[in-house]
C-alpha cells in the first residue's frame, strides 16, 4: 500500500493506477481528470480590494470606487457589523476588534462616516464632519504576538516561543521550505518552493516546533500562486497554502500579522530572518534546529548596483542582510518570513532568491509582501 501510494495514483471510474509523475503534468490521464484536480493553482491579482489598514495605528481606509480616492473611516456610528464587513472584504473570517483613535495632526486623507451596502463598506453620502474627531482602528485577527522576544545578536538557535508562526513545508516528509502562519487556514510561503512538485497530495505542513521532523504534519487542501509573468520571472514569488483543517492556536502555534499597505521600511531598519536552511553556501546540510538572525533593510539602489544584482531587484522585492555580509538566508530557508517588529510582528518579506548566501554585495532578496496584499485578500475572499 505504501509503495503504491508513493509511486502511483488511483483514478476512479474505472478504477486504475497511473504513475504519480503523471499528476499535475497538464494532461488528463484519469478519465474524469482528477489527476489534474489537486494541483498548484494560479489565481490572478484581481480587482482592488476597497478597504485597507494603515500603519498609523491600524486605521481603516475605504476606497471610493467612483473617484479612486481613499478616505479614512470616522468612528462616528461605526459598529461591530461594519467591522466584520471590513474584515470580510479582506478575506478574514475571524471576529474583529476595533476602537476609536484620535485623528492625528498629520492626517492627510479626508475623513468620512462609513455605511454598508451589498456587504461592502461605503462612504455615507450625506454625512457631516467627524464629530468624534476619531478614526477607526481595526484589527481583523489577533496576530504577531509571541511568548518570547529574541535578543539582538548575530545568528543563534531559535525557540518556537519566539516564532510561533514558523512552519516547515515538506514534500514526502523532506523539509523543502519555510512558511508563516497567517490565520487558522492559511500559510504564506514562496511560489518557487512548488516548481518541482505541483501535486498537492504529498505536501505537508509542520507547525509548533523548532526542531525539524519532531511535530505532526498537517494536510494541505490547496496551494495557490500568482500567474507567472515572463517579463519579470523572479517577481510574484509568493504562494498561499490552505490547510485541510484549521489550526488551533496555542503558545507555539500562532499567526504573524500581514504588513500594512503603507509599510515602507527605510534602509537600516532592523529585521529578523529564521529558518532550517543550509548553514553553509553550496554545502553542509539543513539545520535540525531553527536558526534566527538579525539583519537590516538594504537600500534597493545599492542592491541593484553593478557589483550586486544589476537591476534585477524590482519594486515588488526588497533586500535585507548586513552591510559586511555573513548573515543571510540560504537554501531551505525559502518561503520563510522576513520579519519587522512594531507593536506586533509583521511578515514584510518572503525568502525568495539571491546569489550565494551571505555575500557582502549580494544580500538576500525577498518578496515584498505589501505589494501582494490585494492578491492575498482576493484569494482569501474567494475561499471564504
Amino acid at each position: 500500500k505504501v509503495i503504491l501510494d508513493k509511486y502511483y495514483f488511483l483514478c476512479g471510474q474505472p478504477l486504475h493506477f497511473i504513475p504519480r509523475k503523471q499528476l499535475c503534468d497538464g494532461e488528463l490521464d484519469c478519465p474524469l481528470g482528477e489527476d489534474e484536480e489537486h494541483c498548484v493553482k494560479s489565481f490572478p491579482e484581481g480587482p482592488a480590494v476597497a478597504v485597507r489598514l494603515s500603519k498609523d495605528r491600524s486605521t481603516l481606509q475605504v476606497l471610493d470606487s467612483a473617484t479612486g480616492n481613499w478616505f479614512s473611516a470616522c468612528f462616528d456610528n461605526f459598529t461591530e457589523a461594519l467591522a466584520e464587513t471590513a474584515c470580510r472584504q479582506m478575506g478574514y473570517s475571524s471576529k474583529p476588534t476595533f476602537r476609536a483613535v484620535e485623528i492625528g495632526p498629520d492626517q492627510d486623507l479626508d475623513v468620512v462616516e462609513i455605511t454598508e451596502n451589498s456587504q461592502e463598506l461605503r462612504m455615507r453620502n450625506s454625512s457631516g464632519p467627524c464629530l468624534s474627531g476619531s478614526l477607526v482602528s481595526l484589527h481583523c485577527l489577533a496576530c504577531g504576538k509571541s511568548l518570547k522576544t529574541p535578543r539582538v545578536v548575530g545568528v543563534e538557535e531559535a525557540s518556537v516561543d519566539s516564532w510561533p508562526w514558523q512552519v516547515s513545508i515538506q514534500y514526502d516528509k523532506q523539509h523543502v521550505c519555510g512558511g508563516s502562519i497567517l490565520d487558522p487556514h492559511w500559510v504564506l510561503t514562496a511560489a518557487h518552493c512548488f516548481r518541482k512538485h505541483t501535486d498537492v497530495f504529498n505536501w505537508k505542513v509542520r507547525a509548533g516546533s523548532d526542531k525539524l521532523g519532531s511535530f505532526p504534519s498537517l494536510a494541505v487542501a490547496k496551494i495557490i500562486i500568482i500567474e507567472f509573468n515572463p517579463m519579470y520571472p523572479k517577481d510574484n514569488d509568493i504562494a498561499l497554502m490552505k490547510l485541510q483543517f484549521p489550526l488551533t492556536f496555542s503558545g507555539t502555534v500562532r499567526p504573524i500579522c500581514l504588513p500594512f499597505f503603507d509599510e515602507e521600511l527605510t534602509p537600516a531598519t532592523p529585521l529578523w530572518i529564521i529558518g532550517w536552511g543550509f548553514t553553509k553556501q553550496n554545502g553542509g546540510k539543513m539545520s535540525d534546529i531553527l536558526l534566527q538572525a538579525s539583519v537590516q533593510v538594504i537600500d534597493s539602489t545599492r542592491c541593484n548596483a553593478d557589483d550586486a544584482y544589476q537591476g534585477e531587484v524590482t519594486e515588488k522585492m526588497m533586500c535585507a542582510g548586513i552591510p559586511e555580509g555573513g548573515v543571510d538566508t540560504c537554501q531551505g530557508d525559502s518561503g520563510g518570513p522576513l520579519m519587522y517588529q512594531s507593536d506586533q510582528w509583521h511578515v514584510v518579506g518572503i525568502v525568495s532568491w539571491g546569489y550565494g548566501c551571505g555575500g557582502p554585495s549580494t544580500p538576500g532578496v525577498y518578496t515584498k509582501v505589501s505589494a501582494y496584499l490585494n492578491w492575498i485578500y482576493n484569494v482569501w475572499k474567494a475561499e471564504l
Epitope: C74, I103, G104, P105, D106, Q107, D110, V111, V112, S126, S127, G128, P129, C130, L131, G133
Partner: antibody, heavy 120, light 107 residues
C-alpha cells in the same frame, strides 16, 4: 475649485450689529467645519469660533461668547457670522476659513475678508 | 489658553537667503502646529501643518520642524514672492491661538 466668497465692507455705529456672509462652493459644504478669524488693522490673527454646517452646532472663543452668533443656510451653502454690541475695537477684517472634517484641523481655504469699520 | 510667541517679530533678508522663524508654545502641543503666509491686503494661506507636513501646492523651499513647545519655519532660498508676514497657529486645544506674526522684509 474651492471658493469662499464673503460679503462686502460694512460701516457700523457703536452698539449696532453686523452680519457677514460667506458663500462656499467647489466642495461638499456640510462635511467640513467653518471657522471665523478676525484681524484688527496692523494686528495679528484672532480666532473667533467654529460652526458645523451639517448640524448647525457652534463653538465660540470665550472673548466673544454672548456677542457672536454663527448660523448657516444649507440651501445656499452659506455661513453667517453676526457680531452684536459693536465697539470701536471690533474694527477689523473678518475672515471665514474652511477647516477639515475634524475640529483640530488647519484652515486650508480662506475667504477674501470683509472689512467692518465701527465708528461713530 | 495656550500662548504662541514668534521670534523675531520682523526681519530683513535678501533674495536667496535662508530664513528661519521660530514659534514657541506656552505648553506642549505635540505637532499640532500650522504655519500661514499672509501678504498685505490678502487672506492668509496655509503653508505647513502637523509642524512639518507641506500643504499641497506649496513650494518645497518651505519646511517646518519641531515638536512639543519649539517650532521652526525655514525658507531655504528666499524668493521675491516670499516677502510677507508669517503666522504660527496651535491646533492642540481650543481656543485656537496664533502667534503675533513675523514680517519678512526686503533688505
Amino acid at each position: 475649485q474651492v471658493q469662499l466668497v464673503q460679503s462686502g465692507a460694512e460701516v457700523k455705529k457703536p452698539g449696532a450689529s453686523v452680519k457677514v456672509s460667506c458663500k462656499a462652493s467647489g466642495y461638499t459644504f456640510s462635511r467640513y467645519y467653518m471657522h471665523w478669524v478676525r484681524q484688527a488693522p496692523g494686528q495679528g490673527l484672532e480666532w473667533m469660533g467654529w460652526m458645523n454646517p451639517n448640524s448647525g452646532d457652534t463653538g465660540y472663543a470665550q472673548k466673544f461668547q454672548g456677542r457672536v452668533t454663527m448660523t448657516r443656510d444649507t440651501s445656499t451653502s452659506t455661513v453667517y457670522m453676526e457680531l452684536s454690541s459693536l465697539r470701536s475695537e471690533d474694527t477689523a477684517v473678518y475672515y471665514c476659513a474652511k477647516g477639515r472634517e475634524w475640529l483640530r484641523s488647519p484652515f486650508d481655504y480662506w475667504g477674501q475678508g470683509t472689512l467692518v469699520t465701527v465708528s461713530s | 489658553d495656550i500662548q504662541m510667541t514668534q521670534s523675531p517679530s520682523s526681519l530683513s533678508a535678501s533674495v536667496g537667503d535662508r530664513v528661519t522663524i521660530t514659534c514657541r508654545a506656552s505648553q506642549s502641543i505635540s505637532t499640532w502646529l500650522a504655519w500661514y503666509q499672509q501678504k498685505p491686503g490678502k487672506a492668509p494661506k496655509l503653508l505647513i501643518y502637523a509642524a512639518s507636513s507641506l500643504q499641497s501646492g506649496v513650494p518645497s523651499r518651505f519646511s517646518g520642524s519641531g515638536s512639543g513647545t519649539d517650532f521652526t519655519l525655514t525658507i531655504s532660498s528666499l524668493q521675491p514672492e516670499d516677502f510677507a508676514t508669517y503666522y504660527c497657529q496651535q491646533l492642540s486645544s481650543y481656543p485656537l491661538t496664533f502667534g503675533q506674526g513675523t514680517k519678512v522684509e526686503i533688505k
